[in-house]
Protein backbone atom coordinates (compact mmCIF):
# COMPACT_ATOMS: atom_id res chain seq x y z
CA UNK A 1 0.00 0.00 0.00
CA UNK A 2 1.45 3.40 -0.55
CA UNK A 3 0.29 6.91 -0.86
CA UNK A 4 0.27 9.44 -4.03
CA UNK A 5 1.51 12.89 -3.34
CA UNK A 6 -1.09 15.37 -2.31
CA UNK A 7 -1.51 18.95 -3.40
CA UNK A 8 0.61 20.67 -0.35
CA UNK A 9 -2.32 23.34 -0.02
CA UNK A 10 -5.68 24.03 -1.21
CA UNK A 11 -7.50 27.91 -1.82
CA UNK A 12 -10.87 27.54 -1.43
CA UNK A 13 -13.20 31.10 -1.78
CA UNK A 14 -15.08 31.73 1.66
CA UNK A 15 -18.42 29.69 1.19
CA UNK A 16 -18.05 27.35 -1.09
CA UNK A 17 -17.07 23.30 -1.09
CA UNK A 18 -13.53 21.80 -0.25
CA UNK A 19 -13.00 18.83 -1.68
CA UNK A 20 -9.85 16.69 -1.04
CA UNK A 21 -8.36 13.67 -2.62
CA UNK A 22 -7.00 11.04 -0.83
CA UNK A 23 -5.28 9.42 -4.15
CA UNK A 24 -3.32 5.95 -3.26
CA UNK A 25 -3.39 2.28 -4.72
CA UNK A 26 -5.59 0.18 -2.47
CA UNK A 27 -8.24 -2.01 -3.04
CA UNK A 28 -11.88 -1.38 -2.80
CA UNK A 29 -11.65 -2.63 0.77
CA UNK A 30 -9.58 0.30 2.09
CA UNK A 31 -10.44 2.51 4.96
CA UNK A 32 -9.60 5.84 4.14
CA UNK A 33 -9.83 8.31 7.21
CA UNK A 34 -9.72 11.98 7.47
CA UNK A 35 -8.10 14.46 9.98
CA UNK A 36 -7.25 17.77 11.27
CA UNK A 37 -4.15 19.44 12.51
CA UNK A 38 -5.61 22.92 13.73
CA UNK A 39 -4.67 26.28 12.27
CA UNK A 40 -2.35 27.92 14.49
CA UNK A 41 -1.93 24.98 17.38
CA UNK A 42 0.52 22.14 15.52
CA UNK A 43 1.49 20.55 18.22
CA UNK A 44 -2.02 19.66 18.97
CA UNK A 45 -2.92 15.66 18.47
CA UNK A 46 -4.38 15.45 15.08
CA UNK A 47 -8.24 16.08 15.14
CA UNK A 48 -10.82 12.79 13.87
CA UNK A 49 -12.89 13.72 10.91
CA UNK A 50 -14.32 10.95 9.72
CA UNK A 51 -14.26 9.10 6.73
CA UNK A 52 -14.01 9.74 3.12
CA UNK A 53 -17.19 9.75 0.81
CA UNK A 54 -16.38 7.95 -2.04
CA UNK A 55 -14.56 4.74 -2.83
CA UNK A 56 -11.16 7.11 -3.55
CA UNK A 57 -11.67 8.48 0.16
CA UNK A 58 -12.38 11.80 -1.02
CA UNK A 59 -13.15 14.24 1.68
CA UNK A 60 -15.48 17.00 0.99
CA UNK A 61 -16.47 20.30 3.50
CA UNK A 62 -18.90 22.27 2.37
CA UNK A 63 -19.70 26.02 2.79
CA UNK A 64 -16.22 26.66 4.82
CA UNK A 65 -15.42 29.38 6.64
CA UNK A 66 -12.18 30.65 8.38
CA UNK A 67 -12.47 28.08 11.15
CA UNK A 68 -12.03 25.21 8.45
CA UNK A 69 -8.67 26.33 8.04
CA UNK A 70 -5.80 23.98 8.68
CA UNK A 71 -3.56 21.17 7.69
CA UNK A 72 -5.96 17.72 6.26
CA UNK A 73 -4.15 14.48 6.71
CA UNK A 74 -6.07 11.02 5.06
CA UNK A 75 -4.81 8.05 6.42
CA UNK A 76 -6.05 4.79 4.37
CA UNK A 77 -5.83 1.04 6.13
CA UNK A 78 -6.20 -2.12 4.56
CA UNK A 79 -7.27 -5.08 6.81
CA UNK A 80 -5.43 -4.87 9.65
CA UNK A 81 -2.55 -3.45 8.26
CA UNK A 82 -0.54 -0.42 9.67
CA UNK A 83 -2.27 2.88 7.95
CA UNK A 84 -0.32 5.19 5.78
CA UNK A 85 -1.12 8.55 6.12
CA UNK A 86 -0.99 11.52 3.03
CA UNK A 87 1.59 13.99 3.97
CA UNK A 88 -1.26 16.83 4.39
CA UNK A 89 -2.66 19.39 2.32
CA UNK A 90 -3.00 23.45 4.05
CA UNK A 91 -6.79 24.56 3.75
CA UNK A 92 -6.94 28.33 2.96
CA UNK A 93 -9.77 30.01 2.80
CA UNK A 94 -9.81 33.07 0.53
CA UNK A 95 -12.34 35.85 1.46
CA UNK A 96 -14.17 37.48 -1.57
CA UNK A 97 -12.72 40.57 -2.59
CA UNK A 98 -15.34 43.49 -1.07
CA UNK A 99 -17.58 45.19 -3.32
CA UNK A 100 -15.98 48.64 -3.54
CA UNK A 101 -18.13 51.56 -2.25
CA UNK A 102 -18.28 52.82 -6.08
CA UNK A 103 -19.25 49.72 -7.23
CA UNK A 104 -22.78 50.96 -8.68
CA UNK A 105 -24.95 49.40 -11.26
CA UNK A 106 -25.50 51.40 -14.67
CA UNK A 107 -28.91 52.41 -13.68
CA UNK A 108 -27.64 53.80 -10.51
CA UNK A 109 -24.77 56.02 -12.12
CA UNK A 110 -26.98 57.43 -15.07
CA UNK A 111 -29.51 58.50 -12.16
CA UNK B 1 -18.37 26.26 23.73
CA UNK B 2 -19.78 22.98 21.94
CA UNK B 3 -23.35 22.38 22.01
CA UNK B 4 -25.21 20.10 20.67
CA UNK B 5 -29.02 20.04 21.19
CA UNK B 6 -31.67 17.00 20.65
CA UNK B 7 -34.95 17.28 20.00
CA UNK B 8 -38.24 15.63 18.53
CA UNK B 9 -38.59 12.71 21.09
CA UNK B 10 -41.87 11.77 22.77
CA UNK B 11 -44.46 8.90 23.06
CA UNK B 12 -45.22 6.57 20.07
CA UNK B 13 -47.06 3.50 19.36
CA UNK B 14 -45.65 0.42 18.11
CA UNK B 15 -45.07 0.77 13.95
CA UNK B 16 -45.57 4.46 14.63
CA UNK B 17 -42.46 7.43 13.10
CA UNK B 18 -40.45 10.37 15.02
CA UNK B 19 -37.96 12.52 13.81
CA UNK B 20 -34.86 13.40 15.66
CA UNK B 21 -33.00 16.90 15.60
CA UNK B 22 -30.06 18.00 16.86
CA UNK B 23 -29.16 21.56 16.50
CA UNK B 24 -24.96 21.82 16.69
CA UNK B 25 -23.63 25.61 17.64
CA UNK B 26 -19.73 26.22 18.49
CA UNK B 27 -17.98 23.72 16.19
CA UNK B 28 -16.67 23.51 12.37
CA UNK B 29 -20.03 21.49 11.99
CA UNK B 30 -19.68 20.41 8.35
CA UNK B 31 -16.19 19.04 8.75
CA UNK B 32 -17.25 16.24 10.87
CA UNK B 33 -19.10 12.90 10.63
CA UNK B 34 -21.72 12.43 13.18
CA UNK B 35 -23.53 9.62 14.98
CA UNK B 36 -26.44 9.00 16.58
CA UNK B 37 -25.96 6.74 19.97
CA UNK B 38 -28.74 5.04 21.99
CA UNK B 39 -29.50 3.65 25.59
CA UNK B 40 -32.32 2.01 26.93
CA UNK B 41 -33.11 2.41 30.13
CA UNK B 42 -30.54 0.89 32.65
CA UNK B 43 -28.93 -0.28 29.44
CA UNK B 44 -25.52 0.72 27.69
CA UNK B 45 -24.75 2.55 25.00
CA UNK B 46 -25.69 1.09 21.29
CA UNK B 47 -24.33 3.38 18.19
CA UNK B 48 -26.94 3.32 15.69
CA UNK B 49 -25.81 5.68 12.95
CA UNK B 50 -23.55 7.49 11.05
CA UNK B 51 -23.06 10.04 8.42
CA UNK B 52 -20.03 11.45 6.84
CA UNK B 53 -19.44 15.89 6.71
CA UNK B 54 -20.59 16.33 3.32
CA UNK B 55 -23.83 13.49 3.98
CA UNK B 56 -22.77 11.05 0.93
CA UNK B 57 -21.97 8.72 3.39
CA UNK B 58 -24.47 7.21 5.97
CA UNK B 59 -23.78 3.69 8.13
CA UNK B 60 -26.52 1.58 10.14
CA UNK B 61 -26.39 -0.41 12.79
CA UNK B 62 -27.92 -4.20 11.90
CA UNK B 63 -31.16 -2.99 14.40
CA UNK B 64 -32.31 -0.10 12.79
CA UNK B 65 -31.36 -0.82 9.19
CA UNK B 66 -34.06 -0.31 7.14
CA UNK B 67 -36.16 1.58 9.51
CA UNK B 68 -33.93 4.64 10.38
CA UNK B 69 -32.67 7.10 7.85
CA UNK B 70 -30.09 9.94 9.27
CA UNK B 71 -29.63 13.21 7.43
CA UNK B 72 -27.82 16.18 7.63
CA UNK B 73 -29.10 19.81 6.27
CA UNK B 74 -25.29 21.51 6.76
CA UNK B 75 -26.56 25.40 5.50
CA UNK B 76 -28.60 24.88 9.12
CA UNK B 77 -25.61 23.21 11.07
CA UNK B 78 -28.58 20.29 11.82
CA UNK B 79 -27.96 16.46 12.29
CA UNK B 80 -31.82 14.46 12.03
CA UNK B 81 -32.70 10.76 12.57
CA UNK B 82 -36.04 9.66 10.54
CA UNK B 83 -37.10 6.48 12.78
CA UNK B 84 -39.91 4.60 11.02
CA UNK B 85 -41.65 1.34 11.54
CA UNK B 86 -41.33 1.96 15.65
CA UNK B 87 -40.71 -1.05 17.89
CA UNK B 88 -40.95 -1.03 21.69
CA UNK B 89 -37.07 -2.07 21.87
CA UNK B 90 -36.27 1.30 20.41
CA UNK B 91 -37.26 3.04 23.88
CA UNK B 92 -34.36 4.97 24.60
CA UNK B 93 -32.54 7.96 25.26
CA UNK B 94 -30.84 9.06 21.82
CA UNK B 95 -27.88 11.02 21.62
CA UNK B 96 -26.38 12.83 19.27
CA UNK B 97 -22.60 12.37 19.18
CA UNK B 98 -19.15 13.82 16.92
CA UNK B 99 -17.18 10.53 18.14
CA UNK B 100 -13.62 9.88 17.84
CA UNK B 101 -10.32 11.52 19.42
CA UNK B 102 -9.98 14.80 21.20
CA UNK B 103 -12.89 16.29 19.61
CA UNK B 104 -15.73 14.33 21.26
CA UNK B 105 -18.68 15.72 21.48
CA UNK B 106 -22.67 14.64 22.58
CA UNK B 107 -25.86 16.50 23.41
CA UNK B 108 -27.62 15.86 26.73
CA UNK B 109 -29.97 12.82 24.84
CA UNK B 110 -33.95 13.27 24.47
CA UNK B 111 -36.11 10.09 25.07
CA UNK B 112 -38.46 8.27 22.76
CA UNK B 113 -40.67 5.99 24.09
CA UNK B 114 -42.47 3.44 22.32
CA UNK B 115 -45.54 2.37 23.70
CA UNK B 116 -49.29 1.49 23.28
CA UNK C 1 -21.33 -4.93 15.17
CA UNK C 2 -21.46 -7.44 18.30
CA UNK C 3 -20.39 -5.06 21.29
CA UNK C 4 -17.28 -4.94 22.84
CA UNK C 5 -16.57 -6.91 25.69
CA UNK C 6 -16.37 -5.34 29.22
CA UNK C 7 -17.09 -7.02 33.04
CA UNK C 8 -20.00 -6.06 34.06
CA UNK C 9 -18.86 -4.98 37.78
CA UNK C 10 -15.63 -4.10 38.96
CA UNK C 11 -15.23 -2.72 42.55
CA UNK C 12 -13.04 -1.20 44.71
CA UNK C 13 -11.90 0.50 48.15
CA UNK C 14 -10.87 4.20 48.41
CA UNK C 15 -7.33 4.86 47.49
CA UNK C 16 -6.78 1.56 45.63
CA UNK C 17 -6.66 1.16 41.78
CA UNK C 18 -8.73 -0.63 39.56
CA UNK C 19 -8.70 -2.06 35.65
CA UNK C 20 -11.21 -2.33 33.71
CA UNK C 21 -10.53 -4.51 30.65
CA UNK C 22 -12.08 -4.04 27.19
CA UNK C 23 -11.83 -6.79 24.44
CA UNK C 24 -12.73 -6.94 20.38
CA UNK C 25 -11.48 -8.62 17.27
CA UNK C 26 -9.09 -7.19 15.43
CA UNK C 27 -11.72 -5.42 13.03
CA UNK C 28 -12.85 -3.99 16.12
CA UNK C 29 -10.06 -1.96 17.13
CA UNK C 30 -8.01 -2.07 13.68
CA UNK C 31 -4.59 -0.49 13.49
CA UNK C 32 -6.13 3.41 13.86
CA UNK C 33 -6.17 3.01 17.85
CA UNK C 34 -9.36 5.03 18.31
CA UNK C 35 -10.39 3.72 20.97
CA UNK C 36 -12.38 5.90 23.75
CA UNK C 37 -13.30 4.94 27.04
CA UNK C 38 -16.28 7.12 29.10
CA UNK C 39 -17.80 7.81 32.61
CA UNK C 40 -21.46 8.20 32.93
CA UNK C 41 -22.98 9.18 36.41
CA UNK C 42 -27.17 8.40 36.09
CA UNK C 43 -28.89 10.51 33.89
CA UNK C 44 -26.42 12.18 32.28
CA UNK C 45 -24.42 12.24 29.12
CA UNK C 46 -21.20 10.06 28.62
CA UNK C 47 -18.16 11.72 29.86
CA UNK C 48 -14.75 11.43 27.46
CA UNK C 49 -12.00 9.93 29.72
CA UNK C 50 -9.41 8.86 27.70
CA UNK C 51 -9.32 9.16 23.72
CA UNK C 52 -6.70 7.17 21.35
CA UNK C 53 -6.34 4.58 23.90
CA UNK C 54 -3.92 6.26 26.02
CA UNK C 55 -4.30 10.26 25.99
CA UNK C 56 -5.91 12.19 28.40
CA UNK C 57 -8.07 14.80 27.74
CA UNK C 58 -7.64 18.47 29.10
CA UNK C 59 -9.93 18.50 32.23
CA UNK C 60 -9.51 14.74 33.04
CA UNK C 61 -7.34 13.70 36.38
CA UNK C 62 -4.43 11.95 35.74
CA UNK C 63 -5.27 9.03 37.69
CA UNK C 64 -7.28 7.84 34.79
CA UNK C 65 -4.94 5.89 32.39
CA UNK C 66 -5.82 3.94 29.33
CA UNK C 67 -3.73 1.31 27.32
CA UNK C 68 -4.23 -0.96 24.68
CA UNK C 69 -2.18 -4.36 23.44
CA UNK C 70 -3.29 -6.50 20.79
CA UNK C 71 -7.33 -6.81 21.06
CA UNK C 72 -7.82 -6.15 24.74
CA UNK C 73 -7.90 -2.14 25.74
CA UNK C 74 -7.66 -1.24 29.31
CA UNK C 75 -8.79 1.86 31.45
CA UNK C 76 -7.14 1.63 34.75
CA UNK C 77 -8.36 3.96 37.84
CA UNK C 78 -5.75 4.85 40.67
CA UNK C 79 -6.14 6.28 43.54
CA UNK C 80 -10.38 5.12 43.59
CA UNK C 81 -12.34 8.15 45.19
CA UNK C 82 -16.38 8.08 45.50
CA UNK C 83 -17.26 10.25 42.81
CA UNK C 84 -15.56 7.71 40.24
CA UNK C 85 -18.10 5.47 41.09
CA UNK C 86 -19.83 5.32 37.63
CA UNK C 87 -20.62 3.36 34.56
CA UNK C 88 -17.27 3.12 32.17
CA UNK C 89 -17.85 2.13 28.96
CA UNK C 90 -15.37 1.56 25.72
CA UNK C 91 -16.10 2.25 22.35
CA UNK C 92 -13.81 1.95 19.15
CA UNK C 93 -13.68 3.12 15.25
CA UNK C 94 -14.93 0.09 13.08
CA UNK C 95 -14.41 1.75 9.72
CA UNK C 96 -17.00 4.50 7.81
CA UNK C 97 -18.27 6.00 10.15
CA UNK C 98 -19.75 3.00 12.56
CA UNK C 99 -18.48 2.80 16.13
CA UNK C 100 -18.97 -0.29 18.46
CA UNK C 101 -19.43 0.21 22.71
CA UNK C 102 -18.89 -2.50 25.15
CA UNK C 103 -21.84 -3.36 26.98
CA UNK C 104 -20.69 -1.12 30.01
CA UNK C 105 -19.24 -1.75 33.25
CA UNK C 106 -20.17 -0.74 36.36
CA UNK C 107 -17.97 0.71 39.07
CA UNK C 108 -18.53 0.51 42.63
CA UNK C 109 -16.63 2.33 45.47
CA UNK C 110 -16.63 0.41 48.39
Known amino acids: LWMHKVPASLMVSLGEDAHFQCPHNSSNNANVTWWRVLHGNYTWPPEFLGPGEDPNGTLIIQNVNKSHGGIYVCRVQEGNESYQQSCGTYLRVRQPPPRPFLDMGEGTKNR | EVQLLESGGGLVQPGGSLRLSCAASGLTFTSYAMNWVRQAPGKGLEWVSGISGSGGGTYYADSVKGRFTISRDNSKNTLYLQMNSLRAEDTAVYYCAKLGGWSDYWGQGTLVTVSS | QSALTQPASVSGSPGQSITISCTGT?????????VSWYQQHPGKAPKLMIYEGSKRPSGVSNRFSGSKSGNTASLTISGLQAEDEADYYC??????????FGGGTKLTVL
Open chain 3, 26 to 34: SSDFGSYNL
Open chain 3, 91 to 100: CSYAGGSTWV
